[in-house]
């Protein structure tokens, strides 16, 4: 067990703070919830503290919760590939470029680390080149979320990882908006981290609303499990 992994044996409180600017539309989001890495489970509620969110909530899911991939459930035989927990408590910087097909792009930078006993994800997001009447600024996405696989590989030069995946957002007219994600994670501290073999995270997300909440918000339930590396030969002969 890495030293960081020991911090994730029970329920951990999570705070998310995002400051965004998309085509000049500025906004802030606060999120709170908890994670349980034993089950790869995240429950979070997000509030737009600046009024109405200028972009659809589903376009921010990867920035919020795929940001705290330290809550992914890594099966016993894959624990030596869990970069995310090994970087804790000092944490990691997570940078992404998200290309929305035939539309604009988000660039995000986040610091994910423990502050006391709370896991904090502080994010800056800049969005440019979006069409004012496109699927994103035109709010044409359905309020739901598909399952995805998130592909992880080591980046030995930077003592971190590179991550690629493609999100499929459902559009109200029945078509799909693709969002290509290019992600890089580097540790904040200088302690040892686990550099993984190639594998993937399998994610399932459910979006809902709080019937008593008057502010613009999103409620998120997510399950994430690591997969893609089989048991070693020594396991087979036990």
């Amino acid at each position: 067990m890495s030293k960081g992994e020991e911090l994730f044996t029970g329920v951990v409180p999570i705070l998310v703070e995002l400051d965004g600017d998309v085509n000049g539309h500025k906004f802030s989001v606060s999120g709170e919830g908890e994670g349980d890495a034993t089950y790869g489970k995240l429950t979070l509620k997000f509030i737009c503290t600046t009024g109405k969110l200028p972009v659809p909530w589903p376009t921010l899911v990867t920035t919020f919760s795929y940001g705290v991939q330290c809550f992914s459930r890594y099966p016993d035989h894959m624990k030596q590939h869990d970069f995310f927990k090994s970087a804790m408590p000092e944490g990691y910087v997570q940078e992404r470029t998200i290309f929305f097909k035939d539309d604009g792009n988000y660039k995000t930078r986040a610091e994910v680390k423990f502050e006391g006993d709370t896991l904090v994800n502080r994010i800056e997001l800049k969005g440019i080149d979006f069409k004012e009447d496109g699927n994103i600024l035109g709010h044409k996405l359905e309020y739901n979320y598909n399952s995805h696989n998130v592909y992880i590989m080591a980046d030995k030069q930077k003592n971190g990882i590179k991550v690629n995946f493609k999100i499929r957002h459902n559009i109200e007219d029945g078509s799909v908006q693709l969002a290509d994600h290019y992600q890089q994670n580097t540790p904040i501290g200088d302690g040892p981290v686990l550099l993984p073999d190639n594998h993937y995270l399998s994610t399932q997300s459910a979006l809902s609303k709080d019937p008593n909440e008057k502010r613009d918000h999103m409620v998120l339930l997510e399950f994430v499990t690591a997969a893609g590396i089989t048991h070693g030969m020594d396991e087979l002969y036990k």
Partner: nanobody, 122 residues
Framework: QVQLVESGGGLVQHGGSLRLSCVTS????????MGWFRQAPGKERDIVAR????????YYADSVKGRFIISRDNTKNTVYLQMNSLKPEDTAVYYC????????????????RGQGTQVTVS
């Protein structure tokens, strides 16, 4: 689903007492600081009292110091507000809220909030 449900409000005479309760569900209560806020007609929503997750640190607005006591029972996922020596100016809707943040005092910044209970002092 996260829920915070306040109860115990009502009509009380000047100098009387009330005990408000806020029962929570859907989240891990004992990792959250809890706060009570109130909103009088035509006024802003102001913080009344706040209590740390373990219950050892409390904060009170000057207007209620020495009269109100905030407490919590982590085994019952409940926070209380004991209100004594009530005055007409305590008339308001009282809301409870939960947070992981150590520094915020504005009700609008709380992600988890209740629907409120009316307190009227005649």
């Amino acid at each position: 689903q996260v829920q915070l449900v306040e109860s115990g409000g009502g009509l009380v005479q000047h100098g009387g007492s009330l005990r408000l309760s806020c029962v929570t569900s859907g989240f891990t209560f004992d990792i959250h600081d809890m706060g009570w806020f109130r909103q009088a007609p035509g006024k802003e929503r102001d913080i009344v009292a706040r209590i740390s997750k373990s219950g050892d640190i409390t904060y009170y607005a000057d207007s209620v110091k020495g009269r109100f006591i905030i407490s919590r029972d982590n085994t019952k996922n409940t926070v209380y507000l004991q209100m004594n020596s009530l005055k007409p100016e305590d008339t308001a809707v009282y809301y409870c809220a939960a947070t992981l943040r150590a520094t915020i005092t504005s009700f609008d910044e709380y992600v988890y909030r209740g629907q409120g209970t009316q307190v009227t002092v005649s």
